[in-house]
């Protein structure tokens, strides 16, 4: 009984004056509260509470659910307790069999005793089945049995509060023990896309896939720099023990330019968080950006191959795509292709390839690509490098000797002259007039040179070389003179071809 | 003893509004998942909705979505059904139930509290 | 969404009788089948979870089996109060569906 300091207020004094009381089942309970400012008895046991308002609690005929801790309240708070045991050989337990535990927390199995005296107060296995070898517990008679730090290995666990009575064990009903599991890592997340990029008025749905070991994870989507709560969906997935799969679907239902930026999903338990981002760029209308992989203006060897390349950026994607020359279409000799597989790539190649190309096929070659937002084009030059071909060499009424060569780089003309039977033209010989020809041909065809000299100037028996020659090449064309008196003639005129 | 108390049923025109509240007790509020399940008269069980512990995940039928809203006060241990947009067929008792351990169903209902759509 | 087929929709029994309700769900859900039990005017009681699981409180005559798509709930010997509706329920996946009852009636 609690001593009384004179001039505080003190406890309640309860009849009988003893902390525990043991009663038989059938029996009177007869509790006196005595205090001049009483207020109620309570009486709890597992989650049951009563009051009484009287300051006598009487219970004519004990049953084992009275058994239980009575306590007697004044009006200034102050409080005195009895437990009551109500010995009942036929009900040893009282439970409930509602049992959760947090992983390595402490968790109480709730089958307090309704006698104090039997022994062997413990846990068993169901079914005879021992208790895990790491499971500790600590009895108390008036609570239950606590389990010390529950393991997650213990989920499930199916237990009987157990007693020795008379010699014989007596087991209460059974438990099953459910494992809330502790956070022992950030959760995992994954993000259906890295980024999209949509047209203004298109919708933007983007995925989050949150995994954990429980479905009291955290998840949310957030904006970067923005408190706006965003408008989610969710679905959630148990595929088994402490796997738990939840999906956060973002929408927005019709995107705008200013609601490009960057989008995370968050989630976090009691461990840490997690977090993983996708980023949302919204165009106004649709683009194509072409980027040639080489020059624009090509120049290539005659008999040679060269590949056309462009990449470009097309969003939506490319619908049509053609390589064109002189008005006609390439049906084959040209490849498009995406730059890489990913479901998010807008980047795309084309190549055309031309091969053992010749003087008359240089020109301009187009890459023409459309989507169903806009076209764009692009222009390749190709020069074709041909090595000069002499046209004509004449002897012209007007004693003039004329060379008119083509090729292209354009050819420089030279004129020599040889005296004699001599096999190598060294002299020089300048041209009276120079002049390059337009070509009836293509654009970016052959280029055409007149060279002319005079005749008049040779006095002796021999031969003129016209040479005609650029970058890839050199070719000759001869005139032979011999004099018959005063008369000169021109033999028959003669090339040689030098590679 | 774990205890769950529905309120906020009652009559209520098409289109209208009405908010059911879930008092919890006797259980750690915020460790459990909650849903909202009825019953319309004569007829089977549907589940509504369920949030999270945290309230940080809703769920909904198809049925609802885009009319129910279902909230939590964890600071309260109070479950809300926020129902617009009523129709006849929405007339039903409304149960709260806890979640139990997850995936393994709902293991305290409240005695429901029923919603007539009737003009 | 995932469908719930429970079936018979209702069936008589006596007392003592065993009792077998099906239900099927249209894709697999593991082991996340739960029962109910309903009276009228009253709040549906969980008999069992995770399809085999037997809910603290409940009979023992009571027993679930199944994985997958097809689950069983068996009242090995039927009594006075078991006498009720029962819905199967999915919590593989959400949205969580029941099944659409199965009423026991007296014979």
């Known amino acids: 009984q609690p001593s009384v300091s004179p001039g505080e207020p003190s406890p309640p004094s309860i009849h009988p004056g003893k902390s525990d009381l043991i009663v038989r089942v059938g029996d009177e309970i007869r509790l006196l509260c005595t205090d001049p400012g009483f207020v109620k008895w309570t009486f709890e046991i597992l989650d049951e509470t009563n009051e009484n308002k009287q300051n006598e609690w009487i219970t004519e005929k004990a049953e084992a659910t009275n058994t239980g801790k009575y306590t007697c309240t004044n009006k200034h708070g102050l409080s005195n307790s009895i437990y009551v045991f109500v010995r009942d050989p036929a009900k040893l337990f009282l439970v409930d069999r509602s049992l959760y535990g947090k992983e390595d927390n402490d968790t109480l199995v709730r089958c307090p005793l309704t006698d104090p005296e039997v022994t062997n107060y413990s846990l068993k296995g169901c079914q005879g089945k021992p208790l895990p070898k790491d499971l500790r517990f600590i009895p108390d008679p008036k609570a239950g049995i606590m389990i010390k730090s529950v393991k997650r290995a213990y989920h499930r666990l199916c237990l009987h509060c157990s007693v020795d009575q008379e010699g014989k064990s007596v087991l209460s009903e059974k438990f099953i023990l459910k494992v809330r599991p502790a956070f022992k890592a950030v959760p995992v997340v994954s993000v259906s896309k890295a980024s999209y990029l949509l047209r203004e008025g298109e919708e933007f749905t983007v995925t989050c896939t949150i995994k954990d070991v429980s479905s009291s994870v955290y998840s949310t989507w957030k904006r970067e720099n923005s408190q706006t709560k965003l408008q989610e969906k969710y679905n959630s997935w148990h595929h088994g023990d402490f796997n738990y799969e939840r999906q956060a679907t973002l929408t927005i239902s019709s995107a705008r330019v200013n609601d490009s930026g960057v989008f995370m999903c968050y989630a976090n338990n009691t461990f840490g968080s997690a977090n993983v981002t996708t980023t949302l760029e919204v165009v106004d209308k649709g683009f194509i950006n072409i980027f040639p992989m080489i020059n624009t203006t090509v120049f290539v060897n005659d008999g040679e191959n060269v590949d056309l390349i462009v990449e470009y950026e097309a969003f939506p994607k490319p619908e049509h795509q053609q390589w064109i020359y002189m008005n006609r279409t390439f049906t084959d000799k040209w490849e498009d292709y995406p730059k890489s597989e990913n479901e998010s790539n807008i980047r795309y190649v084309s190549e055309l390839h031309l091969t053992r190309l010749k003087g008359t096929e240089g020109g301009t070659y187009t890459f023409l690509v459309s989507n169903s937002d806009v076209n764009a084009a692009i222009a390749f030059n190709v020069y074709v490098n041909t090595k000069p071909e002499i046209l004509t060499y004449d002897r012209l009424v007007n004693g003039m000797l004329q060379c008119v060569a083509a090729g292209f780089p354009e050819p420089t003309i030279d004129w020599y002259f040889c005296p004699g039977t001599e096999q190598r033209c060294s002299a020089s010989v300048l041209p009276v007039d120079v002049q390059t020809l337009n070509s009836s041909g293509p654009p970016f065809g052959k280029l055409v040179v007149q060279s002319s000299i005079d005749s008049s100037a040779f006095k002796h028996n021999g031969t003129v070389e016209c040479k005609a020659y650029n970058d890839v090449g050199k070719t000759s064309a001869y005139f032979n003179f011999a004099f018959k008196g005063n008369n000169k003639e021109q033999i028959h005129p003669h090339t040689l071809f030098t590679p | 003893e774990v205890q769950l108390l529905e309120s906020g049923g009652g009559l209520v025109q098409p289109g209208g509004s009405l908010r059911l509240s879930c008092a919890a007790s006797g259980f750690t509020f915020s460790d459990y998942p909650m849903s909202w399940v009825r019953q319309a008269p004569g007829k089977g069980l549907e589940w509504v909705s369920a949030i999270g512990g945290s309230g940080g995940d809703t769920y909904y039928a198809d049925s609802v979505k885009g009319r129910f809203t279902i909230s939590r006060d964890n600071s309260k241990n109070t479950l809300y059904l926020q129902m617009n947009s009523l129709r006849a067929e929405d007339t039903a008792v409304y149960y709260c139930?806890?979640?139990?351990?997850?995936?393994?169903?709902?293991?305290?209902w409240g005695q429901g509290t029923l919603v007539t759509v009737s003009s | 969404d995932i469908q719930m087929t429970q079936s018979p929709s209702s069936l008589s029994a006596s007392v003592g009788d065993r009792v077998t309700i099906t239900c099927r769900t249209s894709?697999?859900?593991?082991?996340?089948l739960n029962w109910y039990q309903q009276k009228p005017g009253k709040a549906p009681k969980l008999l069992i979870y995770?399809?085999?699981r037997l809910e603290s409180g409940v009979p023992s005559r009571f027993s679930g089996s199944g994985s997958g798509t097809d689950f069983t709930l068996t009242i090995s010997s039927l009594q006075p109060e078991d006498f009720a509706t029962y819905y199967c329920?999915?919590?593989?996946?959400?949205?969580?569906?029941f099944g659409g009852g199965t009423k026991v009636e007296i014979k």
């Open positions: 329920q999915q919590t593989y996946n959400t949205p969580w569906t």
């Open positions: 139930a806890r979640g139990a351990y997850d995936g393994e169903g709902f293991d305290y």
């Open positions: 894709q697999s859900i593991g082991s996340y």
């Open positions: 995770s399809a085999s």
